[in-house]
């Protein structure tokens, strides 16, 4: 095959949005419909991603950039570039192979995605449970039990307001 060869690859002159066509003496041809090249010097164009089914189009494909997908309502993205859509669950649930299941006692999930996580063990930090956990919320830890000695209160109540002209009983 005859071709005059320069030291520089002639394909390097082809900009994004085109491809360097081997079959036409390495001329720069526009990417065909439904394809793109995001960098210069490519010998072919990449096929545009199609956002079908549970995916929906967040950004249309152009000759220089791929389409971007997100997920239809009731689903959320997983993986790089939203490669998968996973079903949402309610707070207090996690997604299993059999669908959304309530969190087991002692665990919680405060989001529509992800797994149920164990409540915080307050005693590991020497603290006590101030507010009990639920399926949707973690426990709230308070001061350590030692701080709550008899006669001591975790929250100091405000002093009663005195009325003018009255001395204390």
């Amino acid at each position: 095959f005859e071709r005059t060869r320069s030291l520089q690859d002639p394909c390097s002159n082809c900009p994004a949005g085109t491809f360097c066509d081997n079959n036409r003496n390495q001329i720069c041809s526009p990417c065909p419909p439904n394809s793109f090249s995001s960098a210069g010097g490519q010998r072919t164009c990449d096929i545009c991603r199609q956002c079908k089914g549970v995916f929906r189009t967040r950004k249309e494909c152009s000759s220089t950039s791929n389409a971007e997908c997100d997920c239809t309502p009731g689903f959320h993205c997983l993986g790089a570039g939203c490669s998968m859509c996973e079903q949402d669950c309610k707070q207090g649930q996690e997604l299993t192979k059999k669908g959304c299941k309530d969190c087991c006692f002692g665990t919680f999930n405060d989001q529509k995605r992800g797994i149920c996580r164990p409540w915080t063990n307050c005693s590991l930090d020497g603290k006590s449970v101030l507010v009990n956990g639920t399926k949707e919320r973690d426990v709230v830890c308070g001061p350590s039990p030692a701080d709550l000695s008899p006669g001591a209160s975790s929250v100091t109540p405000p002093a009663p307001a005195r009325e003018p002209g009255h001395s204390p009983q």
């Epitope: 095959f1 071709r3 491809f19 066509d21 081997n22 079959n23 036409r24 041809s29 990417c31 065909p32 394809s35 010998r43 072919t44 164009c45 990449d46 096929i47």
Partner: antibody, heavy 123, light 107 residues
Framework: QVQLVQSGAEVKKPGASVKVSCKAS????????INWVRQAPGQGLEWMGN????????NYDQKFKDRVTMTRDTSTSTVYMELSSLRSEDTAVYYC????????????????WGQGTTVTVSS | DIQMTQSPSSLSASVGDRVTITCRAS??????LNWYQQKPDKTVKLLIY???RLHSGVPSRFSGSGSGTDYTLTISSLQPEDIATYYC?????????FGQGTKLEIK
């Protein structure tokens, strides 16, 4: 479905010419390159050249460029490969192949192949 | 022209074996590497294009990998119908060139 149907076997004398046809169906004929690849007995595959049916643009391997001519007839979706000045070493099975989708990742692959045409050159 | 060198030139393996065929290009071919299967009846089919993309209808036991100058075709579990000769082909630069082929036989 894509089909490439080639003409029948040929026996030729040295110095003669042979013209092999390849009729395409099942896709848009003018939008895909057609390649010709040959295989001598007991040997590997050898690319001879290609043609773009839309405008008859051709590429020929240096080895064949003085003896090969590729043409097309869009009315019948047929591509022809003519090889002249035949010699015994041109005895081979000749395949036409369709290239992948224009400009896309499979563009430089040959995604469908004809059944092959045996050409025998013998005195 | 770009030279394509396949190895081995022939191999014998048992049904269920994992089989690997390699192809080396004389220069970088930027992943424009395709694999073909030629059956004993001389019919030829595309298996893999652009290094690793499976052509439609090709069983998933076939896979491809590689980059630069070195490429591999793998059959994860050899089947009796895989008896054939396998060819690599570069599509990076005209003229398109093929490896010399690897003849695969069943033990």
């Amino acid at each position: 479905q894509v089909q490439l149907v080639q003409s029948g076997a040929e026996v030729k004398k040295p110095g003669a010419s042979v013209k092999v046809s390849c009729k395409a169906s099942g896709y848009t004929f003018t939008s895909y390159w057609i390649n010709w690849v040959r295989q001598a007995p007991g040997q590997g595959l050898e690319w001879m050249g290609n043609i773009y049916p839309s405008d008859s643009y051709t590429n020929y391997d240096q080895k064949f460029k003085d003896r090969v001519t590729m043409t097309r007839d869009t009315s019948t979706s047929t591509v022809y490969m003519e090889l002249s000045s035949l010699r015994s070493e041109d005895t081979a099975v000749y395949y036409c192949t369709k290239s992948g989708e224009y400009g896309k990742i499979g563009y430089y692959a040959m995604d469908y192949w004809g059944q092959g045409t045996t050409v025998t050159v013998s005195s | 022209d770009i030279q394509m060198t396949q190895s081995p030139s022939s191999l014998s393996a048992s049904v269920g074996d994992r089989v690997t065929i390699t192809c080396r290009a004389s220069q970088d071919i930027s992943n424009y590497l395709n694999w073909y299967q030629q059956k004993p009846d001389k019919t030829v089919k595309l298996l893999i294009y652009y290094t690793s993309r499976l052509h439609s209808g090709v069983p998933s036991r076939f896979s491809g990998s590689g980059s630069g100058t070195d490429y591999t075709l793998t059959i994860s579990s050899l089947q009796p119908e895989d008896i054939a000769t396998y060819y690599c082909q570069q599509g990076n630069t005209l003229p398109y060139t093929f490896g010399q082929g690897t003849k695969l036989e069943i033990k």
